[in-house]
Interface confidence: low
């Protein structure tokens, strides 16, 4: 006859491990007893349990309450045992020794592998600002046994680097994602993906990128200077910019205070019916926590009387 077992039994932390040992004998052969021991290299043998055909299961004190026979029905030639609630310290080599009649003794070894699924954590890097060079966006750490795989899933262009630290019974893997921040990355997801044989599916943690920036400011409203004439109603200047965080706007006049009747409404400067008093240099100040920008324009309010007078003079002079 011969013993049937597995080379490796793999179990997830906290699960029950079935340690298989089945004697496939010839007709009429019987199993008298099965002895289970832990036999890690250099540490000698430590008895787990003795399974006797007549007296049943005897469990050594070190494994009291943790070693059982599989539930019935049981085959008298089956010397398998269950190790309850596997912990990392259970990982190692095990041996079953089977005493048979009349064939004698047989022994076989197996390795118990206890998978420790990782609990990943994602830590965002420092605040991202446009104009920085290569910057840490996030780091992701997962510890398990065996070492987990940590990768990144994102549309954002960047570089990754990983390092692992081996502990006595596990390994911690940290992967860092570095990028050169740009405004187009705002709101983009950066997902840490952790794979491990002890997980039914990959674990994913997503971080949404926030990149601080402030665009150059520009002022609209002066595209047609001829519209800026005395008496015109509804004239306005609008300051254009964008930023993250959203910017605030402030209007000033470079050559004096804002004229009375001019309304500041956020990014818009609204004028009452235009007079020559409204001519001047206007400045839009745009700012957020990241930066500030200025844009200035010169308003020159035309006097139609002066213009028509000039035209007459030109005609008469010709």
């Amino acid at each position: 006859g011969e013993l049937e077992t597995s080379d490796v039994v793999t179990v997830v932390l906290g699960q029950d491990a079935k340690l298989p040992c089945f004697y496939r004998g010839d007709s009429g052969e019987q199993v008298g007893q099965v002895a289970w021991a832990r036999v890690d290299a250099g540490e000698g043998a430590q008895e787990l349990a003795l399974l006797h055909s007549k007296y049943g299961l005897h469990v050594s004190p070190a494994y009291e309450g943790r070693v059982e026979q599989p539930p019935p029905p049981r085959n008298p030639l089956d010397g398998s045992v269950l190790l309850r609630n596997a912990v990392q310290a259970d990982e190692g080599e095990y041996e079953c020794r089977v005493s048979t009649f009349p064939a004698g003794s047989f022994q076989a070894r197996l390795r118990l592998r206890v998978l420790v699924p990782p609990l990943p954590s994602l830590n965002p890097g420092p605040a991202l600002e446009e104009g920085q060079g290569l910057t840490l966006a996030a780091s992701c750490t997962a510890e398990g046994s065996p070492a987990p795989s940590v990768t990144w899933d994102t549309e954002v262009k960047g570089t990754t680097s990983s390092r692992s630290f081996k502990h006595s019974r596990s390994a911690a893997v940290t992967s860092e994602f570095h990028l050169v921040p740009s405004r187009s990355m705002n709101g983009q997801p950066l997902t840490c993906v952790v794979s491990h044989p002890g997980l039914l599916q990959d674990q994913r943690i997503t971080h949404i990128l926030h990149v601080s920036f402030l665009a150059e400011a520009s002022v609209r409203g002066l595209e047609d200077q001829n519209l800026w004439h005395i008496g015109r109603e509804g004239a306005m200047l609008k300051c254009l910019s964008e930023g993250q965080p959203p910017p605030s706007y402030n209007w000033t006049r470079l050559d004096g205070p804002l004229p009375s009747g001019v309304r500041v409404d956020g990014d818009t400067l609204g004028f009452p019916p235009l007079t020559t008093e409204h001519s001047g240099i206007y400045v839009c100040h745009v700012s957020n926590e990241f930066s500030s920008r200025d844009s200035q324009v010169t308003v020159d309010v035309l006097d139609p009387q002066e213009d028509s007078g000039k035209q007459v003079d030109l005609v008469s002079a010709s």
Epitope: G133, L134, T159, S161, S162, R163, S164, H178
Partner: antibody, heavy 117, light 106 residues
Framework: QVQLQESGPGLVKPSETLSLTCTVS????????VHWIRQPPGKGLEWLGV???????DYNPSLKSRVTISVDTSKNQFSLKLSSVTAADTAVYYC???????????WGQGTLVTVSS | DIQMTQSPSSLSASVGDTVTITCRAS??????LAWYQQKQGKAPKLLVY???NLADGVPSRFSGSGSGTDFTLKINSLQPEDFATYYC????????FGGGTKVEIK
């Protein structure tokens, strides 16, 4: 003890493709990268690229259009192909091993490739 | 690419001297720097990784220091077998090497 050994033709004609093989022995290359690095005569070192045991690659951007690195894991062999060579590609070509970080703990002895007609 | 500037490009020293080689990165590379020794006609040999960690089998007279952009390789009590060319290399993104420092016998 891990050992790396480069092999391939010592002379390549201009505009042709340079092909080299790196054979790794004495250890597993699982979870390691095999890199190609070159050194023109009397000059400094230049990193060309890396391939990981799983087959993923990373190349030097300045040579990316011309470099291809591949692996035959069953033979523990890693190949470098550099296309459209010129005299400026004449160098000693090394293969080297690294972990996840790109510093190189084991190197081959190097092989001199001359580009000449 | 990050540029690595090594100085001096060559130096002369005697057995027993202390030698210092510096390497400057064009941007912050944190501690992602390695040092290699290369003898004529041979492959480079890793001396130091992650700026300060001595590689296996490297004598303790070698030491690395620095972080960010400025790094140093120091050889205490120079031995005859230490006359060689030394290279720094960053591994922060695409690796690049310094131009090398040749340590010659005075």
């Amino acid at each position: 003890q891990v050992q790396l050994q480069e092999s391939g033709p010592g002379l390549v004609k201009p505009s042709e493709t340079l092909s080299l093989t790196c054979t790794v022995s004495g250890g597993s290359i699982t979870n390691y990268g095999v890199h190609w690095i070159r050194q023109p005569p009397g000059k400094g070192l230049e990193w060309l690229g890396v391939i990981w045991s799983g087959g993923s690659t990373d190349y030097n951007p300045s040579l990316k259009s011309r470099v291809t690195i591949s692996v035959d894991t069953s033979k523990n062999q890693f190949s470098l192909k550099l296309s459209s060579v010129t005299a400026a590609d004449t160098a000693v070509y090394y293969c080297a091993r690294s972990g996840k970080w790109y510093y190189f703990d084991y190197w081959g002895q190097g092989t001199l490739v001359t580009v000449s007609s | 690419d990050i540029q690595m500037t090594q100085s001096p490009s060559s130096l002369s020293a005697s057995v027993g001297d202390t030698v210092t080689i510096t390497c400057r990165a064009s941007q912050n590379i944190y501690s992602n720097l390695a040092w290699y020794q290369q003898k004529q006609g041979k492959a480079p040999k890793l001396l130091v990784y992650a700026a300060t960690n001595l590689a296996d089998g490297v004598p303790s007279r070698f030491s690395g220091s620095g972080s960010g952009t400025d790094f140093t390789l120091k050889i205490n009590s120079l031995q005859p077998e230490d006359f060689a060319t030394y290279y720094c290399q960053h591994f922060w993104g695409t690796p690049t090497f310094g131009g090398g420092t040749k340590v010659e016998i005075k």
